[in-house]
């Protein structure tokens, strides 16, 4: 068997809305995968698994299940979003992010995904990591690949 | 329905402790936070802090920082509340609170039926 | 900390009439989300305090019509149209926006 390659193209769009009384915020980030067969016979994805972590606490978790088939050598794109919220411990958070006086409220996550590949009953798992920029201050739609992170600080807690 | 019990009077002395009850019912305990106030005799209200009974999570007012203790069983859906180094400034009826509502319109919606504590040598 | 002002500790009414009871804070309560967090609750002698008002103007389940909450930003107004018997007691304003959440005083309602 050839390989199946998963890339991780980057956020595709964050929603966000606030709770003002338990200062919370809530994410909706969706992201993008290209899944590549390299195969010249069909597989499944089987399941898409993903969480998001900001300041290396989990805010989200996701599981898509019975995604789509790939054909051979074939590439298909597949969105997934992950529902996130920044509260509590992290309720700091919501001070920047509503903060008027800046236009860009950019916060560093790391996503992670995993996904589950299979083909004559063999069961195959490819996971990726990414740090992405995220603006939690109003909903944003991303060009693709225009979130990744680079080397900057995190806001400071 | 909805109820909030709470323990019975407690009688204490200076420097001693208490640990106040808030039992739960008619509604799903980990879906909403659950707030303290107490009242002094005669007095206004104070709000003392909350516990998030699904994380355990709490938030004190600073006034109450080294005075309570707020935690939370979700199998028994009771609330708890250790008041510790009791002076006489501590003698109150102490009310739990439910915060129901939804994101951005919360407010509390049920009281318990309130535990008097009084503090005396 | 938000500090809540009940400046009258009583008011005394007649059953029948109508009374306004007011609250002042020291910061606006009105969010950008054009929500304004001040809420007023009943406390009946000898009982748990009960929510009246939440929102400035939204009356709580179960609450007769009698009651209505109105208000700015810093002032707010709890009126009690054709005043019964039942409605003595002391009447808490509190904001809800900002940690500490905190009440007012108190203005304690009594039938003449």
């Known amino acids: 068997p050839r390989s199946i390659d998963v890339k991780y193209i980057g956020v595709k769009s964050a929603y966000v809305s606030y709770d003002v009384q338990k200062r919370t915020i809530y994410l909706n980030i969706t992201n993008t995968l290209n899944i590549t067969n390299n195969n010249y016979y069909s597989v499944e994805v089987e399941n898409i698994t993903a969480q998001v972590q900001f300041a290396k606490t989990v805010i989200g978790k996701a599981r898509l299940n019975n995604i789509t088939h790939i054909g051979p050598l074939d590439m298909k794109q597949i969105d997934y979003t992950v529902p996130t919220v920044i509260a509590e411990e992290m309720s700091y958070m919501y001070d920047f992010c509503t903060l008027i006086s800046i236009k860009v409220h950019n916060i560093v996550l790391m996503m992670q995904v995993t996904v589950t590949t299979t083909y004559f009953g063999h069961s195959e798992q490819i996971s990726q990591e990414r740090y992405q920029y995220v603006d939690c201050g109003r909903n944003t739609t991303y060009q693709l690949g225009q979130s990744e992170y680079l080397n900057v600080l995190q806001p400071q807690q | 329905q909805v109820q909030l019990q709470q323990s019975g009077a407690e009688l204490a002395k200076p420097g001693a402790s208490v640990k106040l009850s808030c039992k739960a019912s008619?509604?799903?305990?980990?879906?909403?936070?659950m707030h303290w106030v107490k009242q002094r005799p005669g007095q206004g209200l104070e709000w003392i802090g909350y516990v998030n009974p699904s994380s355990g999570y709490t938030k004190n007012n600073q006034k109450f920082k080294d005075k309570a203790t707020l935690t939370a069983d979700k199998s028994s859906s009771t609330a708890y509340m250790q008041l510790s180094s009791l002076t006489y400034e501590d003698s109150a009826v102490y009310y739990c609170a439910r915060e129901g509502g939804s994101i951005s319109d919360w407010y509390f919606d049920v009281w318990g039926t309130g535990t008097t504590v009084t503090v005396s040598s | 900390d938000i500090v809540m002002t009940q400046a009258a500790p009583s008011v005394p009414v007649t059953p029948g009439e109508s009374v306004s009871i007011s609250c002042r804070s020291s910061?606006?309560?009105?969010?950008?989300?054009?929500?304004?967090?001040s809420y007023w609750f009943l406390q009946r002698p000898g009982q748990s305090p009960q929510l009246l008002i939440y929102r400035m103007s939204n009356l709580a389940s179960g609450v007769p019509d009698r009651f209505s909450g109105s208000g700015s930003g810093t002032a707010f107004t709890l009126r009690i149209s054709r005043v019964e018997a039942e409605d003595v007691g002391v009447y808490y304003c509190m904001q809800h926006l900002e940690y500490p959440y905190t009440f007012g005083g108190g203005t304690k309602l009594e039938i003449k």
């Open positions: 008619g509604y799903t305990f980990i879906s909403y936070w």
């Open positions: 910061k606006s309560l009105l969010h950008s989300n054009g929500n304004t967090y």
